[in-house]
């Protein structure tokens, strides 16, 4: 989801902006900094374990507004955020994943033939 | 249009610090980042740091972090740089850059002579 | 930090000649969001920098369209197709991609 009521349209920031890093940092981060001409993100999502585990960094501008949508995707608990208002915005941002479905249990991964 | 205006020179002793400063017009202060850069006399250039006014977040070359302070006023659109702990090798032409994704203006620079 | 390789250190032309001038970096300046963050600029003696070419060949405004740059990755290059009197001075080629941001040595410029 966006935060602040930001448009869903993707326009071109004046300037860089610098995101947190973690589990998702690019070789040209430094000290888990991140640069992006999009937006920062929080991302929680659950591992094959059903651990979850949360990974922030930078989106690009390019394909940022399909990624920061947060569509649901079948059998994947997972949920993002993205923010551009300040540098490092996205500590402060703390998705939760979504509640577990019955199906979810019952037609889950696991089941799979 | 655009404009940074930056003092013409500065005399200080070894030892003192300096504060420089960088006054911009003619564009939105807080929607570019303002970077700072060294030149010293028949030399390269060197990036210090840079700091966003919108939310004062700053970026330093680790050579320079506890030489450089980088803060800015945004009422009155001014990046100051302070420089501490002056020594000869301090005597450069430091230059305020506006910054968004590349330096696309520069302010004249302001040289500073560090002597007893 | 990333290194920032140009040559020549001094490049003698006649007025009207194509000039040349390679930057090469230690690293590749692809950024993680696709761009190349390679520019170059023009300092005159006595001036600050002025920004000639951004993001590898994009001609900043204003600048004449003798100016090109081309190249990728670590490879680059500005070209001036025929060098007028104005041009004299020292290019220095810059990265943003990657911090600490860096800079060439610079070329001069000169009359033959």
């Known amino acids: 989801k966006k935060e602040d009521g930001e448009s869903t349209a993707p326009t071109a920031r004046p300037k860089v902006l610098r995101c947190k890093c973690h589990h998702h940092c690019p070789e040209d981060s430094v000290n888990n900094i991140c640069s992006t001409d999009g937006y920062c993100f929080t991302m929680i999502e659950e591992d094959d374990s059903g651990t979850p585990v949360v990974t922030s960094g930078c989106l690009g501008l390019e394909g940022s507004d399909f990624q920061c949508r947060d569509t649901p995707i079948p059998h994947q608990r997972r949920s993002i955020e993205c923010c551009t208002e300040r540098n490092e915005c996205n500590k402060d941002l703390h998705p939760t994943l979504p509640p577990l479905k019955d199906r979810d249990f019952v037609d889950g991964p696991i089941h799979h033939k | 249009q655009v404009q940074l205006q930056q003092p013409g020179a500065e005399v200080v002793k070894p030892g003192a610090s300096v504060k420089l400063s960088c006054k911009a017009s003619?564009?939105?202060?807080?929607?570019?980042?303002m970077q700072w850069v060294k030149q010293r006399p028949g030399q390269g250039l060197e990036w210090i740091g840079e700091?966003?006014?919108?939310?004062?977040?700053?970026m330093y070359n680790q050579k320079f972090k506890g030489k450089a302070t980088l803060i800015v006023d945004t009422s009155s659109s001014t990046a100051y740089m302070q420089l501490s702990s002056l020594t000869s090798e301090d005597s450069a032409v430091y230059f305020c850059?506006?910054?968004?994704?590349?330096?696309?203006?520069w302010g004249q620079g302001t040289t500073l002579t560090v002597s007893s | 930090d990333v290194v920032m390789t140009q040559t020549p250190l001094s490049l003698p032309v006649s007025l009207g000649d194509q000039a040349s001038i390679s930057c090469r970096s230690s690293?590749?300046?692809?950024?993680?969001?696709?761009?190349?963050?390679l520019h170059w600029y023009l300092q005159k003696p006595g001036q600050s920098p002025n920004l000639l070419i951004y993001?590898?060949?994009n001609r900043f405004s204003g600048v004449p369209d003798r100016f090109s740059g081309s190249g990728s990755g670590t490879d680059f290059t500005l070209k001036i197709s025929r060098v007028e009197a104005e041009d004299l001075g020292v290019y220095f080629c810059s990265q943003s991609t990657h911090v600490p941001f860096t800079f060439g040595s610079g070329t001069k410029l000169e009359i033959k």
């Open positions: 993001k590898v060949s």
């Open positions: 003619g564009y939105t202060f807080t929607n570019y980042w």
């Open positions: 850059a506006r910054f968004g994704y590349y330096v696309d203006y």
């Open positions: 700091i966003d006014p919108s939310d004062r977040y700053t």
């Open positions: 690293q590749s300046l692809v950024h993680s969001t696709g761009n190349t963050y």
